[in-house]
Amino acid sequence: SERCDDWGLDTMRQIQVFEDEPARIKCPLFEHFLKFNYSTAHSAGLTLIWYWTRQDRDLEEPINFRLPENRISKEKDVLWFRPTLLNDTGNYTCMLRNTTYCSKVAFPLEVVQKDSCFNSPMKLPVHKLYIEYGIQRITCPNVDGYFPSSVKPTITWYMGCYKIQNFNNVIPEGMNLSFLIAFISNNGNYTCVVTYPENGRTFHLTRTLTVKVVGSPKNAVPPVIHSPNDHVVYEKEPGEELLIPCTVYFSFLMDSRNEVWWTIDGKKPDDIPIDVTINESISHSRTEDETRTQILSIKKVTSEDLKRSYVCHARSAKGEVAKAATVKQKVPAPRYTVEGGGGTGGLNDIFEAQKIEWHEGGGHHHHHHHHHH
């Protein structure tokens, strides 16, 4: 056969569906690869062809559209399973072609089993709710197109093995689950089961999502730099190691990028001709507020380095802040000698500057390591 534009196996669309449930799978060509839709292609005389490769096989084979009760069918750019079976798992290909044009893409379909409490290997979408924010809703996802609007399905909401019936602040309202006020205790997996009739048969759609209660925008503040601060002075002698932590608290903000960085004499450490290492660690609170710590380290500090300006900067969608560390060269204590043989030598106060270092530790989720010269 003549050449075909092959988009390969689109692993970005790892489609997972439950065993023994209906599944409608759109050909990804029109969604992600081509600049025209199915209707345009069809009216231009292009035909959509489906075939598949079974799991652990290399052989491409046509899809059997002549199964009892039309278990597998095609409608426009959608491949329908009514319902799926476990051995439908495999790589599916949709190919759009006529005598002069050909384009195809493959995608993996995994038919997944669940237990009586809806546990399964299915990857779950996460829905974030703001803590103590007022009424918020989650909606039973990915059920559009399964039944016409004239059909009134029954929807049952579960948390784990059990139906949600009298769950204080959580109220099932058809396709929606309303949280009158969300608390940390509302974290967890919620499942909607949609039951609808079709041609004398009853089908079930099971959809599980994870609810994560996060910090409210009402309480969000600009980044807060806990360290460096005015109470800590970094006094070093040349040759010693200089360690300065920059510890910043970020309120949870949806889709905000939190950044922390150091400047030395107004420049990025990359642009300074000294041997600087920066280690970053990140930890999260239960409501996904974030604490980032970047420890700036100079192994053998010089007297020149101790005269530089070290500034920690932080930025989020709420604003940008900066704080300079107080770095000083330790003054060596003067040496006093007793002159003459029997002199009494007066009482001398010897002040030694105190070395103060504060090191943020413990329980971090991520670690990054940067080395600058």
Epitope: Q113, D115, S116, N119, G160, C161, F167, N189
Partner: antibody, heavy 119, light 107 residues
């Protein structure tokens, strides 16, 4: 340390009801599920039903539907199983068992309550 | 409901020997199976869930395998405290159902 402590043995007449309690300690009562499982003398285990106190929700095995009622009192972290219209074949040890509302296996068990139905 | 059938009803084994217990489901339960141990006068104790995952504090000599309709509990080297009755439980479908049990006794 999770503990489930059940009420004491009961002797009941046929046709009457029995209510067995199960007091839970350790962990948040409302975030768990309590199942009831019975075992007739010399027999195997039989799941009767369960409750998720925090969700106000119960599930029952078809066999016991209409005859068993499972309730919970969150203020005292206690679950109850009431079985009505008792017959001699209901003579058994009744266990409560607890786990997460997400898991269908039973990790923590009470010591059991023997219910004897005899005229 | 799913019927769980265990075999043999009784297994006579000497201490230190291997014991293999079987559990069969009347229809596929995927890997949604648990094993429990029960000693006389005691409540059952969870050994295995997910067909092969050992519960907290369960010694490594206990192992579970299988999926679909055929499952096995293996005790690699029987200790005196392992002589008991063992039950399988499916939780793929409601109602959850148990096998009738296998008694492991000293030979």
């Amino acid at each position: 340390q999770v503990q489930l402590v059940q009420s004491g043995a009961e002797v009941k007449k046929p046709g009457s009801s029995v209510k067995v309690s199960c007091k839970a300690s350790g962990g948040h009562f409302s975030q768990f599920a309590i199942s009831w499982v019975r075992q007739a003398p010399g027999q195997g285990l039989e799941w009767m039903g369960g409750i998720a106190p925090g969700l106000g929700s119960t599930r029952y095995a078809q066999k016991f539907q209409g005859r068993v009622t499972i309730t919970a009192d969150e203020s005292t972290s206690t679950a109850y199983m009431e079985l009505s219209s008792l017959r001699s074949e209901d003579t058994a040890v009744y266990y409560c068992a607890r786990d997460s509302i997400y898991s269908a296996w039973l990790a923590y068990w009470g010591q059991g309550t023997l219910v004897t139905v005899s005229s | 409901e799913i019927v769980m059938t265990q075999s043999p009803a009784t297994l006579s084994v000497s201490p230190g020997e291997r014991a293999t217990l079987s559990c069969r489901a009347s229809q596929s339960v995927s890997s949604n199976l648990a094993w429990y141990q029960q000693k006389p006068g005691q409540a059952p104790r969870l050994l295995i869930y997910g067909a092969s995952t050992r519960a907290t504090g369960i010694p490594a000599r206990f192992s579970g395998s299988g999926s679909g309709t055929e499952f096995t509990l293996t005790i690699s080297s029987l200790q005196s405290e392992d002589f008991a009755v063992y039950y399988c439980q499916q939780y793929n479908n409601w109602p959850w159902t148990f096998g009738q049990g296998t008694k492991v006794e000293i030979k």
